[in-house]
């Protein structure tokens, strides 16, 4: 069977070769070929070429669509690490340091304080804040951590809030707050973390972090 297939392939190849040679002869205007024959052969060849080109275009389109499909849903994720700051602001500062993540330019850390997204969609946003406080040294008010959203054309909005009472441990007791939820973000929206007393936040490795993930 294989031998017969081989003979068949060789015969087809020979026919193709003869066909190509005939086109060549037509082009050089050899007297032995009639004009009618040449016209027929030429139009046949043009048909083949057209088919080949159309196939090529289709493949190109499919490939570019695949690329677009991939581009439409790239992974968007960020995880940033807390940074001690001399600023008295209640907004926590973050840095791209240690074991951080910044998937691509569709999410950016702006002014060290907010994560800004370029694409609309549902995002899981989270923050862990570890703080060390003492009941006697602190005010009566609990330690509050807030996850806030600022979108273009809108006032900032609190998405999530958590409160912990101060520890009685001396000099201070470590406690952690974890906030996390799924929210619809618009292009240009920024999320940031606010705390009642930034001086009590622990910046040791792994204690305080902030991030998001596009679902």
């Amino acid at each position: 069977h294989r031998r017969l297939d081989k003979i068949e392939d060789e015969r087809n190849l020979h026919e193709d070769f003869v066909f190509m040679k005939t086109i060549q002869r037509c082009n050089t205007g050899e007297r032995s070929l009639s004009l009618l024959n040449c016209e027929e052969i030429k139009s046949q060849f043009e048909g083949f070429v057209k088919d080949i080109m159309l196939n090529k275009e289709e493949t190109k389109k499919e490939n570019s669509f695949e690329m677009q499909k991939g581009d439409q849903n790239p992974q968007i994720a960020a995880h940033v690490i807390s940074e001690a700051s001399s600023k008295t602001t209640s907004v926590l500062q973050w840095a791209e340091k240690g074991y951080y993540t910044m998937s691509n330019n569709l999410v950016t850390l702006e002014n060290g304080k907010q994560l800004t997204v370029k694409r609309q969609g549902l995002y899981y946003i989270y923050a862990q804040v570890t703080f060390c406080s003492n009941r006697e040294a602190s005010s009566q008010a609990p330690f509050i951590a807030s996850l806030c959203l600022k979108s273009p054309g809108r006032f900032e909005r609190i998405l999530l809030r958590a409160a912990n009472t101060h520890s009685s441990a001396k000099p201070c007791g470590q406690q952690s707050i974890h906030l996390g939820g799924v929210f619809e973000l618009q292009p240009g929206a920024s999320v940031f973390v606010n705390v009642t007393d930034p001086s009590q936040v622990s910046h040791g490795t792994g204690f305080t972090s902030f991030g998001l993930l596009k679902l």
Epitope: S146, C148, S151, P152, G153, R154, F155, E156, R157, I158
Partner: antibody, heavy 119, light 107 residues
Framework: EVKLVESGGGLVKPGGSLKLSCTTS????????MSWVRQTPEKRLEWVAS???????YYPDSVRGRFTISRDNARNILYLQMSSLRSEDTAMYYC?????????????WGQGTSVTVSS | DIQMTQSPASLSASVGETVTITCRAS??????LAWYQQKQGRSPQLLVY???TLAEGVPSRFSGSGSGTQFSLKINSLQPEDFGSYYC?????????FGTGTKLELK
């Protein structure tokens, strides 16, 4: 039905103080950003102050340091404490609710309270 | 600060006519523009936000258009209750600023 009712306006001397109130009903007050907007005698509208649902406050340069916006979520009241008043603060003061909780556009306005600063 | 320039300052028209009021921002505000109507002795009322979205209860004869820095409010087939003053306001960022107003009077 959303209702906003301003009060506390009146005649005050330059350098004096006044506290405006806006009593609200018909919506969940603490979920919305609220603002004060004034209309001058020449009918120009000027933004005066805003407070977000998270209690962040915003002011234009013309009133920053002189005016303070605050809210009492338990009583559904918005306040504007005005001090060091000037003649250019003379206007009709409106309180307004922000559309869709936190948009900068304002969908409901009160009937206004008049403030005149004059010696 | 973003300056909002409104024109014309005043306009006379008859019932049934179509009028257009324009508003220009000193820098791009994308589609963050609102239009308000104020009748004599009353408080302003939101007509349009996000440049073209009609507020609840606003008749369809009102329409907003534009983006970037150029915006317009069109009122088709004017009704007696449409006469009054109209203000644009950018709602892109703070400070919030309003246009100077357009007084629409009955011809």
């Amino acid at each position: 039905e959303v209702k906003l009712v301003e009060s506390g306006g009146g005649l005050v001397k330059p350098g004096g103080s006044l506290k405006l109130s806006c009593t609200t009903s018909g919506f969940t007050f603490n979920n919305y950003a609220m603002s004060w907007v004034r209309q001058t005698p020449e009918k120009r509208l000027e933004w005066v102050a805003s407070i977000s649902s998270g209690d962040s406050t915003y002011y234009p340069d013309s009133v920053r340091g002189r005016f303070t916006i605050s809210r009492d979520n338990a009583r559904n009241i918005l306040y504007l404490q005005m001090s060091s008043l000037r003649s250019e603060d003379t206007a009709m003061y409106y309180c307004a609710r922000h559309y869709d909780y936190d948009s900068y556009a304002m969908d409901y306005w009160g009937q206004g309270t008049s403030v005149t600063v004059s010696s | 600060d973003i300056q909002m320039t409104q024109s014309p300052a005043s306009l006379s028209a008859s019932v049934g006519e179509t009028v257009t009021i324009t508003c220009r921002a000193s820098e791009t505000i994308y589609s963050y523009l609102a239009w308000y109507q104020q009748k004599q002795g009353r408080s302003p009322q939101l007509l349009v936000y996000n440049a073209k979205t009609l507020a609840e209860g606003v008749p369809s004869r009102f329409s907003g258009s534009g983006s970037g820095t150029q915006f317009s409010l069109k009122i088709n087939s004017l009704q007696p209750e449409d006469f009054g003053s109209y203000y644009c306001q950018h709602h892109y960022n703070t400070p919030l600023t309003f246009g100077t107003g357009t007084k629409l009077e009955l011809k």
